[in-house]
Amino acid sequence: MMTGTIETTGNISAKKGGSVILQCHLSSTMAQVTQVNWEQHDHSLLAIRNAELGWHIYPAFKDRVAPGPGLGLTLQSLTMNDTGEYFCTYHTYPDGTYRGRIFLEVLESSVAEHSARFQIP
């Protein structure tokens, strides 16, 4: 039975050229996290964090994605094309798979505020 809950940074806005932290947090379960996948709306994998093997950043994102903090991901040098959905997938034992969603809006404005709050998507 899956008792856990994924909390995420929810909906984020950030400036073009800046960086943003994508965070998901799994709570309310004692399940062991074996792997966390980060992907975009088009199913492109950005990064994988395996409990035994550590982080793997996919080549297409190597220059702009940094692992962490924690199981999160830092996306750098933001472009307008980065606007969209991001998904974290927690593979756990024995619970199974948990998924979270973050929507990122990249703003042209130099006065864009960085806003984020933890929420259940």
Epitope: H41, G84, E85, F103
Partner: nanobody
Framework: QVQLVESGGGVVQPGRSLRLSCAAS????????MGWFRQAPGKERESVAA????????YYADSVKGRFTISRDNSKNTLYLQMNSLRAEDTAVYYC??????????????????WGQGTLVTVSS
């Protein structure tokens, strides 16, 4: 309870166009992120296009980019899918879906709360 009813499907020749509509009733349509999905015979359901409640954000599957356009008229409680340059591989049952609330588009079926019954699109010469 939200009700979604698709229309506009039918048989069309390759290269031609169709426009699907999805009429919503029983809810606050203007606050719903919406999407179109399709399921071809023997295949899994896949996302086609999605649009945010305020129409600022849209998503298209790679297979339909440049050919399909999603839009909505919040004053008419209706979602649309304009399909141009249709191909045989576009043949499927097309479903519209709505989510109670949220920011941006939702490209994946798991996030939707309400579904229509579908309309069949057949592309054949």
């Amino acid at each position: 309870q939200v009700q979604l009813v698709e229309s506009g499907g039918g048989v069309v020749q390759p290269g031609r166009s169709l426009r699907l509509s999805c009429a919503a009733s029983g809810g606050s349509f203007s606050s719903y992120p919406m999407g179109w999905f399709r399921q071809a015979p023997g295949k899994e359901r896949e996302s086609v296009a999605a649009i945010s409640s305020d129409m600022r954000f849209t998503y298209y599957a790679d297979s339909v980019k440049g050919r399909f356009t999603i839009s909505r008229d919040n004053s008419k409680n209706t979602l649309y899918l304009q399909m141009n340059s249709l191909r045989a591989e576009d043949t499927a049952v097309y479903y519209c879906a709505a989510r109670d609330s949220g920011v941006g588009y939702y490209s994946r079926a798991q996030w939707y709360d309400y579904w229509g019954q579908g309309t069949l699109v057949t592309v054949s010469s």
